[in-house]
């Protein structure tokens, strides 16, 4: 999988789209997970509705939402109130049983708020760009949503 880069601005919302073959993935729930290192299981940030027919309903986990257009074949993830620590490597996944297929690898880049001059460098406009990642990326793990929360069980 190539890695698609999405740029967002701190404090704003970022929408990430993951297109897929609607026939091939018919009846499958979808998920969004974050990779926090080169190794580790892909731990879920948020997944679509338990009832596949209701996948169009937006589901939230903290500041992250997911909704699935199962006919059009587009999974959409919204990251609200984007923060620098939301940057990173993510995956859109299609679930079947205990397995998960990667639909898209996504790199979220968080740019400093142009109205906040404390740390800002030269700012780019947010958008989407393709980058060709040959690097071997296998696994992922997730993060605690808020500093101080007790996160997922550690894996190694």
């Amino acid at each position: 999988h190539n890695t698609t880069v999405f740029q967002g601005v701190a404090g704003q919302s970022l929408q990430v789209s993951c297109p897929y073959d609607s026939m091939k993935h018919w009846g499958r729930r979808k998920a969004w997970c974050r990779q926090l290192g080169e190794k580790g299981p892909c731990q879920r940030v948020v997944s679509t509705h338990n009832l596949w027919l209701l996948s169009f309903l937006r589901r939230w986990n903290g500041s992250t939402a997911i909704t699935d257009d199962t006919l059009g074949g587009t999974l959409t993830i919204t990251l609200r109130n984007l923060q620098p620590h939301d940057a990173g490597l993510y995956q859109c996944q299609s679930l079947h049983g205990s397995e998960a297929d990667t639909l898209r690898k996504v790199l979220v880049e968080v740019l400093a708020d142009p109205l906040d001059h404390r740390d800002a460098g030269d700012l780019w406009f947010p958008g989407e760009s393709e980058s060709f990642e040959d690097a071997h990326v296998e696994h992922s793990i997730s993060r605690s949503l808020l500093e101080g929360e007790i996160p997922f069980p550690p894996t190694s």
């Epitope: 990173g88 880049e109 968080v110 780019w124 980058s131 993060r143 996160p151 190694s156």
Partner: antibody
């Protein structure tokens, strides 16, 4: 194999300038945040600055803000640190590192380049 | 800024010993901690991230635990190549701050 190779260190007088470079190979450079971490002689580690994968935003430690400028050239797989108004307390080994985006830990490090600020 | 304090500052051990070193944060940092190993004249190497996740190629004798403000790095059976200085780092929310280090020496 991920490799980071720093260059540009040396002796400079207080108030002077220096530009460090870091040549990266073994990974898709444009998909990774990068950073510099320094270590004063006989001391611990100090994060200096970080840069997003496109170079769109930079973040600096308070100790260098306004004096150091971090940039990158993704077409050349190279990271730069422009250091101006150097002070004696900037004397350190400067390490180029690959930062895991959004997490702020450094998974690969260069061998370091020594910057000495002295009259 | 959150301060990271490591103890002890130095530690003597023999090959085969089980050793532990600690890192204390001045405020709750959840599980947002990394550990590095540094040998004299060399660059640091990442050992663990998010408290307990071993980085690629790190031997299983290295393990991490803790959450909130108190963290521990354990080497279950010290090997000759493990004598080095170990640093903890607060991660996930900047500024990224390091502890002052624990030096593991041969007894």
């Amino acid at each position: 194999e991920v490799q980071l190779l720093e260059s540009g260190g040396g002796l400079v007088q207080p108030g002077g300038s220096l530009r460090l470079s870091c040549a990266a190979s073994g990974f898709t450079f444009s998909n990774y945040y990068m950073a510099w971490v320094r270590q004063a002689p006989g001391k611990g580690l100090e994060w200096v600055a970080s840069l997003t994968n496109s170079g769109g935003s930079t973040y600096y430690a308070d100790s260098v803000k306004g004096r150091f400028t971090l940039s990158r050239d993704n077409s050349k797989n190279t990271l730069y640190l422009q250091m101006n108004s150097l002070r004696a307390e900037d004397t350190a080994v400067y390490y180029c590192t690959r930062e895991w985006a959004g997490s702020g830990y450094f998974d690969y490090w260069g061998q370091g380049t020594l910057v000495t600020v002295s009259s | 800024d959150i301060q990271m304090t490591q103890s002890p500052s130095s530690l003597s051990a023999s090959v085969g010993d089980r050793v532990t070193m600690t890192c204390k944060a001045s405020q709750n940092v959840g599980n947002n901690l990394a550990w590095y190993q540094q040998k004299p004249g060399k660059a640091p190497k990442l050992l663990l991230y998010y408290t307990s996740n071993r980085f690629t190629g790190v031997p299983s004798r290295f393990s991490g635990s803790g959450s909130g403000t108190d963290f521990t790095l354990t080497i279950s059976s010290v090997q000759p190549e493990d004598f080095a200085t170990y640093y903890c780092q607060r991660i996930y929310n900047s500024p990224w701050t390091f502890g002052q280090g624990t030096k593991l020496e041969l007894k």
